[in-house]
Each structure stands twice: as structure tokens, then as C-alpha cells.
């Protein structure tokens, strides 16, 4: 912190420019105008200071504004949005989409900060609901910030957001999360043809249904373990053995390795044993020979 | 965003240097540059500035005239031309720069030592 001295004769600052930068510390702190710079913030996005000299800057703001900052200043924060802590944030009304741009840029290209993270919540809580405006804003940024969100908040997502996903951004999406996201992708991608059609909706499929995955397994797309390890258990189950060995193609053998993990495990014990046999992997644990396989779900149903 | 400076070293009382400043993973040609000094035990010094298009130019009082500063964007680099070295010019020098929205970066710094 800058002790307070009187500022010399002459170096009043009257406007933010880039005489500034020939300044000490404590002759920002003295010679600058709090109500000056909250004003002209602007300006300093355009003044190549030191990291030291936007401390001093950050620190008059905070005086000025102890209970947090008016959006006319916080959409001119650039880089000092950085040095906030998530409880100056957290003081701050967000309600334009501009600012909240504005903001995202500074951080563009790196994770998403802590800032980040409460500068959204306070956006979304400031708004009361999360429209397609900000979430087109968000996932344009934070792809992966889909996965942060509830099936019923995805459930606005426009399927144009889907197309900025990258396979990374769904490593934490549950199976609830993508079986929202899926048709979404599938409406998406709809008009790819098939080769680039998989590449694309390849990590959305743990939201596929069944009839979808057997689709799949006649075009040749030779699925790889790990996105198959992924698929939900019950669209994975009644697919049949043939159908699981194109769905594969030459990744059927990595079948062995996952035998004892869901959805292979469960997948197995669905299947008759001489079927597995044909696939000459030595799978066991499908339905042994002669015997009958009823379909209680489907009973029930019709009782 | 990181820059890189370069050009330092030891040179004689009235001799010359000239620093430059380049960009590490991003182009340069849209920031303001400003060129800073620390010498030991002191606080860090602005010495000029130049503007993204080269236009505008600023500079201390302690170097007015002995010093200039330019850019070239087709080399993605910002010059400091310094003549007529005095001992007190002894410094790490460093570049910092701001662009859209305000984004960032400072370099690490390069020697010169007037002796």
C-alpha cells in the first residue's frame, strides 16, 4: 500500500493519458483523481502500465467505491478484472451483456478463473435466468461451461452453441447433461455426411439411444473403446453381438479389456455365450446354450 | 501473453544501445508499448511510450533527447534507441504492453550497465 504524500507541484493528473506512466506509485496515488479515473477507465486500457501501477489504480477505485464497483466502471476494467478478488466481484450488479463480454475477453484463452466463475453467477443471478443471449456469450468463451449447468438450464441451449464444443469441454458432463445436449448435437451436425458426422458427435453420444447407436454400427465408423465405455448401459444392451462388432470394427478386441467394467460386463450377460464365441475374443459370462431368454420388461408391460 | 526483451549489456559512458521488445505467442502490432527501468534498491521508472500505430511517442524528462523510441510491425518489434549513455541509465529495462481489452504482457527485462 502507498502511504499518502501531497502531490509536487504541476503533476496533477487532469486527464488519464499516458504521461501517467512516467509517475511513481505514490505519485498516482497522490495526483490522481479517484472520481478522475473511474470517469476515464477507459483510457487506461489503451496505457501500457506496470503491473505495480495498476495496483495503486485498483486501490483508488476500491476507496472510491467500497461497496463495489458501478458497471460504468467495471466495463472498462480490462486487465484490472484480473486483479479483483471473487469477493470484489461478488459486490458488483452485472446487467449488460457488453460488460460481461467485455470482461470475458481480458481472460480469453485461459480456464476459467475463479473471477470468471463469480462474475457469471452474478451475471445469471443479476438477469434471473439464463437466455439464449448469455448462453451463446458463454459457450462462444467456456465451451466447457455446459457441463456446469443443469439439464433443465441446458435445455435453452441453442444447437448453434454446440458447434464451438470441443471434445475436452464434456469430460465432466453426466449422463443427465448429455442426454440433453445429444439431440441437440444430432440437430447440429445433422447435415454432415458420415465420417464427418461421427467425428462430431462422437463425445456426445453418452446421451444416444439405442436405435441411434445401431444406425451407427451400419456405417462404418469404427468407434473407439473409450468413447464406447462412455455409452449409456441401457442403449448399449440390446444391441446384438454383430452389431456391437461393426460398431467397433477393428476396436472389438479392446472388448476383452473392459469385460469386467460397465457397459461391456452388463452388455455380456445380455448376450447368448455362442454369439460372443464367433467374436473369438474369449468373453464369457454370456447366456449359456439352450437356454431361454425372457424378456421380463416387456412382459410386464403387456400384463 | 509474454514479451521478450533483448539488446542489453556493458557499454562505456556516451556510448549506444538500442533494445528491442518482441512478443511470445501473439503479435504485437495492435499494442502500446511502454519501456520501464529499475535500477538496484529503487523503484520501477517509466522511460517512453509508444502508441500500437507508432504515431504518438512519450518520454521521461531524465532521457528526452538521448533516447527513441519506434516500432516496426512488419518485425513485430518495439525499439528503444539509447545514445549518449550516462552511468545513471543503469538499469534493467523492460517493455509492457496493453491491448484490446485491455490484455497485458511484460517481459523479464535485459541488462544495461553504463560503466
Known amino acids: 500500500e502507498v502511504e499518502k504524500t501531497a502531490c509536487p507541484s504541476g503533476k496533477k493528473a487532469r486527464e488519464i493519458d499516458e504521461s501517467l506512466i512516467f509517475y511513481k506509485k505514490w505519485e498516482l496515488e497522490a495526483c490522481v483523481d479517484a472520481a478522475l479515473l473511474a470517469t476515464q477507465m477507459d483510457r487506461v486500457n489503451a496505457i501500457p502500465f506496470t503491473y505495480e501501477q495498476l495496483d495503486v489504480l485498483k486501490h483508488k477505485l476500491d476507496e472510491l467505491y467500497p461497496q463495489g464497483y458501478p458497471e460504468s466502471v467495471i466495463q472498462h476494467l480490462g486487465y484490472l478484472f484480473l486483479k479483483m478478488s471473487p469477493e470484489d466481484i461478488r459486490k458488483w450488479n452485472v446487467t449488460s451483456l457488453e460488460t460481461l463480454k467485455a470482461l470475458l475477453e481480458v481472460n480469453k484463452g485461459h480456464e476459467m478463473s475463479p473471477q470468471v466463475a463469480t462474475l457469471i453467477d452474478r451475471f445469471v443471478k443479476g438477469r434471473g435466468q439464463l437466455d439464449k443471449d448469455t448462453l451463446d456469450t458463454l459457450t462462444a468463451f467456456y465451451p466447457g461451461y455446459l457441463c456446469s449447468l443443469s439439464p433443465e438450464e441446458l435445455s435453452s441451449v441453442p444447437p448453434s452453441s454446440i458447434w464451438a464444443v470441443r471434445p475436452q469441454d464434456l469430460d465432466t458432463c453426466d449422463p443427465r447433461q448429455l442426454d440433453v445436449l445429444y439431440p441437440k448435437a444430432r440437430l447440429a451436425f445433422q447435415n454432415m455426411n458420415g465420417s464427418e458426422y461421427f467425428v462430431k458427435i462422437q463425445s456426445f453420444l453418452g446421451g444416444a439411444p439405442t436405435e441411434d447407436l445401431k444406425a451407427l454400427s451400419q456405417q462404418n465408423v469404427s468407434m473407439d473403446l473409450a468413447t464406447f465405455m462412455k455409452l449409456r448401459t441401457d442403449a448399449v444392451l440390446p444391441l446384438t453381438v454383430a452389431e456391437v462388432q461393426k460398431l467397433l470394427g477393428p476396436h472389438v478386441e479392446g472388448l476383452k479389456a473392459e469385460e469386467r467394467h460397465r457397459p461391456v460386463r452388463d452388455w455380456i450377460l445380455r448376450q447368448r455365450q455362442d454369439d460372443l464365441d464367433t467374436l473369438g475374443l474369449g468373453l464369457q459370462g454370456g447366456i449359456p446354450n439352450g437356454y431361454l431368454v425372457l424378456d421380463l420388461s416387456m412382459q410386464e408391460a403387456l400384463s | 501473453l509474454q514479451l521478450v526483451e533483448s539488446g542489453g549489456g556493458l557499454v562505456q559512458p556516451g556510448g549506444s544501445l538500442r533494445l528491442s521488445c518482441a512478443a511470445s505467442?501473439?503479435?504485437?502490432?495492435?499494442?502500446?508499448v511502454g519501456w520501464f527501468r529499475q535500477a538496484p534498491g529503487t523503484e520501477r521508472e517509466g522511460v517512453s511510450s509508444?502508441?500500437?500505430?507508432?504515431?504518438?511517442?512519450n518520454y521521461a524528462d531524465s532521457v528526452k533527447g538521448r533516447f527513441t523510441v519506434s516500432r516496426d510491425n512488419a518485425k513485430h518489434t518495439v525499439y528503444l534507441q539509447m545514445n549518449s549513455l550516462k552511468p545513471e541509465d543503469t538499469a534493467v529495462y523492460y517493455c509492457?504492453?496493453?491491448?484490446?481489452?485491455?490484455?497485458?504482457?511484460m517481459g523479464q527485462g535485459t541488462s544495461v550497465t553504463v560503466s
Open positions: 509508444i502508441s500500437s500505430s507508432g504515431g504518438s511517442t
Open positions: 509492457a504492453a496493453v491491448g484490446d481489452y485491455g490484455r497485458r504482457a
Open positions: 505467442g501473439f503479435t504485437l502490432d495492435s499494442y502500446a
